[in-house]
């Protein structure tokens, strides 16, 4: 099951917030609301799944209240009238503390997870497909609202002439390169739904979309370094990012970062001064534990060209260099759609970027 066509996240939205849920609610849609309960003002906040922006029709009103020892109210509002409340007399949120709130839409109910534990099940009182808006209000600060929609949809592949399990063609390289042999990674259950080729012809960093044609190859102008671009829709299982370039002859280090807001979800850092390929995650300016193990020798060579293919899967990123699988990096930041920025810097010259 692949995530195809997931909606881009709302990043650091101001509260009160109302935003469209593209395509409405669907069975299997997972919506993550990440934020912090304000410690100072107010005793309530609410997340609403509603029809339109008026607030008169709310299919699911999720309303933590820091009152009477703390409890959570769940309810439905139809034509301006509230139904009977369902109360959960345990408060999983704490004032002043961050939270990770995940809503899973299923055919019979909403399932709500708070901080990694299933918190409540709310059976639908009205058809959920009417919902097209999410709103958040009250004593809360939001980091992001992200969307993941697990479904297999037959769409026209971006690589329409190249099955995904076949070699990916990069621009020509000065030295004999090995393409990815068939079967290095299994074919994905859903094809890539959108490909963006980044080129620097008239405008540095310009990008355009080729949703239904094979990736085009371009001349090799120098990309501006550091190179920063948006990953439209963020990461999701089956998403690929392709880069090629040349390591400078005197290179010490370079990096490829996949970023989520201020966090670096994936830091790929070849270090020629240490003969290592370091992988890590930075959350709130704090680095986690490094991963350095490799199945073979350092694949990057000073003065030589390279290609990097990053394939996002549900559990991990798979990274291939010069067509050969190199390592897996298990997600430390799991809200994949929020990982929506690519940053490349250091001692290389980029020749091709495809997100």
């Amino acid at each position: 099951m692949a995530f195809s066509g997931s909606q881009a996240p709302y990043l650091s939205p101001a509260v009160p917030f109302s935003g469209t849920i593209q395509g409405g609610l669907q069975d299997g849609l997972q919506i993550t609301v990440n934020g912090t309960v304000l410690s100072s003002s107010g005793t309530r906040f609410a997340v609403n799944f509603q029809t339109g922006f008026s607030g008169n029709d709310i299919a699911f009103h999720f309303n933590p209240r820091f009152e009477d020892g703390g409890y959570v109210v769940c309810n439905t509002r139809q034509n301006g009238s509230w139904g009977p409340e369902e109360r959960k007399t345990h408060m999983p949120f704490q004032k002043g503390m961050p939270f990770d709130l995940c809503f899973l839409v299923q055919s019979s109910d909403f399932k709500v997870m708070v901080n990694g534990i299933l918190f409540v099940q709310y059976f639908h009182r009205v058809p959920f497909h009417r919902v097209d808006t999410i709103s958040v209000n009250g004593s809360v600060q939001l980091s992001y609202i992200s969307f993941q929609n697990p479904r297999t949809v037959p769409v026209q592949p971006a690589f329409s002439t190249v099955p995904f399990s076949q070699p990916v063609c990069f621009p020509p390289r000065p030295r004999g390169r090995r393409q990815k042999p068939p079967g290095v990674w299994p074919a994905n259950p859903a094809p890539i739904t959108q490909t963006v080729i980044h080129t620097v012809q008239s405008a540095p960093g310009q990008m355009f979309s080729t949703p239904a044609i094979p990736p085009m190859m371009y001349p090799h102008p120098a990309y501006p370094m550091p190179f920063i671009t948006t990953i439209l829709g963020g990461l999701y299982p089956s998403k690929s990012i392709l880069l090629s370039g040349t390591v400078l002859p005197s290179a010490q280090r370079f990096h490829i970062n996949l970023c989520s807001g201020n966090h670096i979800a994936f830091h790929l850092n070849p270090r020629f001064d240490e003969n290592a390929v370091v992988r890590n995650t930075q959350i709130d300016n704090s680095w986690g534990s490094e991963e350095r193990s490799l199945p073979r020798k350092m694949p990057f060579v000073r003065g030589q060209s390279f290609s990097v293919w990053i394939l996002c899967e549900a559990h991990c990123l798979k990274v291939a260099v010069d067509g050969q699988h190199l390592f897996e990096y298990y997600h430390r930041l799991r809200n994949l759609p929020t990982i929506n920025r690519l940053e490349v810097g250091g001692d290389i010259q980029l020749t091709h970027v495809q997100t």
């Epitope: 099951m1 692949a2 995530f3 299997g28 997972q30 990440n34 959960k88 345990h90 999983p92 704490q94 503390m97 961050p98 939270f99 990770d100 899973l104 109910d109 399932k111 997870m113 708070v114 901080n115 990694g116 534990i117 299933l118 918190f119 409540v120 099940q121 697990p150 299982p237 995650t281 959350i283 986690g288 534990s289 549900a314 559990h315 298990y330 997600h331 430390r332 930041l333 799991r334």
Partner: antibody, heavy 124, light 109 residues
């Protein structure tokens, strides 16, 4: 390969303290919930506490609330259980476990990886 | 707290037998129930998660089902390596977000 390794168990007198460690490899504790589960000799499994470092959230069983503190050091990829005011009834093998919540487009409500356990004996 | 009442506490069976173990939750826990197998001196192993999903690498003779607040673990044809203690566990947020059943010891008849 995912692995959890507990350490820090041993013999302690009633009222004493111990700090258990749970070193993780193959995944990161920052994006998982880590639980401590104990098993008294010849008895069943008892949930003790959990931490969800991603949002700094934790929770405790009533039997240990106020005495035990769970924490995590994401830079060391390690979770800890600080046990104070220990009692004889806290004697048990203590396991740490990863509670995986989302995998392959499915919710996984279960503890998919466990450590080997570390024995804590509270006796005078 | 949500209680998980597991039955029977022990049972004797022969190789090839069909074995059923039941857990009843004291209130709705949705599908947030897992089943574990534990052998003496070893850590528990996950068999079934989300009430009915078979965990990776677990033989298909193990299955889980749910009917309301009743959860069942079935071993369709008991094998010699299946003699062990089995636990159910719920993870539905309450004052104690995780609780285990008392365990069922499956012994050789």
């Amino acid at each position: 390969e995912v692995q959890l390794v507990e350490s820090g168990g041993g013999l302690v007198q009633p009222g004493g303290s111990l700090r258990l460690s749970c070193a993780a490899s193959g995944f990161t504790v920052s994006s998982s919930s880590i639980h401590w589960v104990r098993q008294a000799p010849g008895k069943g499994l008892e949930w003790v506490a959990y931490i969800y470092p991603y949002s700094s959230s934790s929770s405790y069983a009533d039997s240990v609330k106020g005495r035990f503190t769970i924490s995590a050091d994401t830079s060391k990829n390690t979770a800890y259980l600080q046990m104070n005011s220990l009692r004889a009834e806290d004697t048990a093998v203590y396991y740490c476990a990863r509670y995986s919540t989302y995998s392959s487009s499915k919710w996984v409500w279960g503890m998919d990886y466990w450590g080997q356990g570390t024995l804590v004996t509270v006796s005078s | 707290d949500i209680q998980m009442t597991q039955s029977p506490s022990s049972l004797s069976a022969s190789v090839g037998d069909r074995v059923t173990i039941t857990c009843r939750a004291s209130q709705s826990v949705s599908s947030a129930v897992a089943w574990y197998q534990q052998k003496p001196g070893k850590a528990p192993k996950l068999l079934i998660y989300s009430a009915s999903s078979l965990y990776s690498g677990v033989p298909s003779r193990f299955s889980g089902s749910r009917s309301g607040t009743d959860f069942t673990l079935t071993i369709s044809s008991l094998q010699p390596e299946d003699f062990a203690t089995y636990y159910c566990q719920q993870s539905y947020y309450d004052s104690n977000p995780i609780t285990f059943g008392q365990g069922t010891k499956v012994e050789i008849k």
